[in-house]
Interface confidence: medium
């Protein structure tokens, strides 16, 4: 069976039907490049006006305009708000009332696309394996990133969150149109990784999505993650404005100027520093969501009532922090280089600025307790990775799980830890699962490109797709079309239950109280320390500021600094970094 032309609110669309075997039978209908919205530069997205005739939806559209990996050029385009759909089909009748899984990609709110990285036409976020193995519809889409997606003056002139509103428009489009593709509009699961996972979390918290989302999965990211909300958007807006020659004193004039500036210039005006800086790298993630009083009406911690009826799976990778540790403490990955106490303390203090010296000291002390017994470089390096994993991923996720559970009415809550070790040959032998290592398994790459993987990798992928798609179908990862290796019990506040995802999942994979000592430290000991306010520190910005971003500002409840100009010698910067 195949769909043929499908009528949507914008007009007819026609995709391609791909047979899954030479003998015929099962197939998948694939639609690529359906427009779901339009947007002008630094404006909220609007519904797409539609088209005449039949839209041939056979090719991925270009990603939203963003800097290349070298940050010295751009690729993609401004006209980028398109989505892609995979619909599994049986032999005889076309599918109907299938669960729908809408994917939100990660990339630090700075990069990425709905199709994902591409090697020889093998796209990372190809939805085929999930769709066909789990018998669900998969939708991926593009949203605006970087300055074009998240630049904000912190007021009505440029409220920001354009990328989040794009995501919402995609979800709303799916709600309105997916029935025509055989999907159940009342059973939409949104899932995402990293910035996409935080986006999933933010979408569930936003009042704009009331009634749109039935379930959600966040893989390595939450609205509560310290890198997910920008507390001082005006600082970064002014930084960009200065670079492109726009006025900065009046936000109205600045916004008007920025909106008519070449989008490529806006995009290239910001560079994420990838070499070690004074602060941890996540502090330089400038263009990310903001609390705008509208789409995100309040601090995310206060919005959990909005998730009372949304089933949730949330988890992290056991060494999610490794990627960030390699930037902040480069010696972590270098066998011939050593990590020192000073390196680690500098990292710790950079992540605990709000609590001043006492916060840094207490954090340093608890994390280095094991060093007296085992002062080996392996142990010290693992501590650095564990610390970054805790601060950036584990603690926010655990707090979010607890909030979700505490506010749940009909909603169910599940937690996991992905521990299947990275396959990167250059990594240290002690390496676990790095940030984004889970993606290939969720998207079925060990099946799509079997020669690149081992049987154990396929076991992991099979289990994850089974749990994920069962959850999308029923709200319970154990119940659905796919058999699972062991029963995944829901998260409880008392036990902190989680599933440890490895190559061999058994009943012993259900565990409790992940890193409880450290969770208690952050939630209790660290939390009660007095917050340091109004502190300044003086940093010398990099000489060539085309290379890196300026020093990050504080939460704008503190003194708002003057961003460094190209010729400044020292930049004043309050020490609290809005974590």
């Amino acid at each position: 069976a195949k769909l043929g032309a499908v009528y949507t609110e914008g007009g007819f669309v026609e995709g391609v039907n791909k047979k899954l075997s030479l003998l015929g039978g099962d197939s998948v209908d694939i639609f690529k490049g359906i427009p779901f919205a339009t947007a002008k530069t630094l404006e909220n997205p609007q519904r797409h006006p539609g088209w005449q005739g039949t839209l041939k939806a056979t090719n991925f559209k270009k990603r939203c305009l963003q800097a290349t990996i070298t940050q010295d050029n751009t690729y993609g385009q401004e006209d980028c708000l398109y989505l892609n759909i995979w619909v599994p089909q049986g032999r005889k009748q076309v599918s109907h009332n299938l669960p729908v899984m809408v994917w939100i990609y990660g990339g630090a709110f700075l990069m990425g696309s709905g199709q994902g990285a591409n090697f020889l036409k093998n796209y990372l976020y190809d939805g085929e394996e999930i769709a066909t193995r789990g018998n669900v519809i998969v939708v991926t889409f593009n949203y605006r990133v970087g300055p074009l997606g998240f630049l904000s003056t912190g007021d009505a002139n440029l409220p920001g969150n354009f990328g989040l509103r794009d995501q919402h428009m995609a979800i709303a489009w799916v709600k309105r149109n997916i029935a025509a593709f055989g999907g159940d509009p009342d059973n939409i699961t949104i899932f995402g990784e990293s910035a996409g996972a935080a986006s999933v979390s933010l979408q569930t918290l936003s009042p704009y999505n009331k009634g749109l989302i039935r379930r959600a999965i966040s893989q390595s990211g939450m609205a509560l993650s310290p890198w997910a909300i920008q507390k001082n958007p005006l600082f970064w807006a002014k930084t960009i404005a200065k670079k492109v020659g726009c006025p900065t004193e009046d936000t109205g004039k600045m916004a008007a100027c920025l909106k008519i500036t070449d989008p490529r210039a806006l995009t290239l005006a910001y560079k994420l520093p990838v070499k070690k800086q004074e602060y941890p790298v996540v502090h330089y993630l400038a263009f990310i969501p903001v609390i705008d009083g509208d789409f995100i009406p309040d601090d995310p911690i206060n919005l959990y009532n909005n998730t009372a009826d949304i089933d949730y799976i949330a988890g992290i990778n056991n060494m999610d922090g490794h990627l960030f540790a390699t930037i902040d403490v480069p010696a972590v990955d270098k066998t011939k280089q050593t990590v020192t106490e000073e390196d680690f303390y500098r990292l710790v203090s950079g992540h605990t600025v709000a609590k001043g010296l006492k916060g840094a000291q207490a954090t340093f002390d608890i994390y280095t307790e094991s060093w007296a017994q085992d002062p080996s470089q392996e142990n010290m390096k693992k501590t650095v990775v564990a610390f970054e994993t805790d601060v950036l991923f584990l603690i926010p996720t655990e707090i979010a799980l607890a909030q979700h559970k505490a506010h749940a009415k009909s909603a169910k809550t599940y937690s996991y830890l992905f521990s299947h070790p990275s396959r990167m040959p250059i990594y240290p032998k002690w390496m676990g699962a790095d940030h984004a290592d889970d993606l290939q398994y969720v998207f079925g790459k060990p099946f799509a490109t079997p020669l690149g993987y081992r049987p154990q990798d396929r076991a992991v992928s099979k289990a994850m797709i089974a749990y994920w798609t069962n959850f999308a179908r029923s709200g319970d990862p154990n119940m659905g079309n796919s058999p699972v290796p062991t029963h995944w019990y829901p998260y409880t506040l008392e036990n902190g239950n989680y599933l440890d995802i490895t190559k061999t999942i058994t009943s012993a994979s259900m565990k409790e109280h992940l890193r409880e000592k450290f969770l208690k430290f952050w939630a209790v000991t660290f939390e009660v320390l007095p917050t340091v306010t109004g502190d300044q520190d003086t940093l010398t910005p990099p000489e060539d500021d085309s290379e890196v971003a300026p020093d990050p500002p504080s939460d704008d409840s503190q003194v708002v600094p003057v961003p460094p100009t190209d010729d400044s010698v020292e930049a004043q910067m309050p020490a609290t970094i809005g974590f």
Epitope: R346, S349, T352, G356, L357, F364, D535, Q536, D537
Partner: antibody
Amino acid sequence: QVQLVQSGAEVKKPGASVKVSCKASGYTFTSYNMHWVRQAPGQGLEWMGVINPSDGATSYAQKFQGRVTMTRDTSTSTVYMELSSLRSEDTAVYYCARDYYGSSPLGYWGQGTLVTVSS
Amino acid sequence: DIQMTQSPSSLSASVGDRVTITCSASQSISYLHWYQQKPGKAPKLLIYAASKLPSGVPSRFSGSGSGTDFTLTISSLQPEDFATYYCHQRSSYPTFGQGTKLEIK
């Protein structure tokens, strides 16, 4: 990149007070303790006290209790050490020194300020 | 206060010599640190936590010991090593040893 820059030399009369400053840069000022250590001519190093720039808390060596006051100004990332009731034996080079990490050795030192007490 | 006693107070040695300086604490301490000071300059951290070298410190310097007795060793003296060396403890109120002056023979 860590720099501690101290104020210039001072000459004081016995009974007077002196206030030495130490301006920090290149790191998060509130994340590291700052100590004051002095060294009389031809003598060894003598710890005077420490200030937590985060909250202004101080701890002084018994010998200097009542005579020394350490303060900080977070807006300028500067710490100050004031020593009162000066005597000739207070003639020394006064150093500010920052923790290396946590509660650790003194990893970074100012260039020193010579205070001469003479009638 | 914990008293720190260094020995010897001074010693003469030649370039290429192996030199050992000891530091004794009046009671057991967790960590001991060593500093090098040249005339007219601020002290410089040489060894921390008894045996660890900060970046930039040559590997000819080494430290050992625990409890109350600690040692600083320079395996092969270089001309720039002639200076005064201080031990330092941070277990209670910080205190320094009286210093060991290393001179050219």
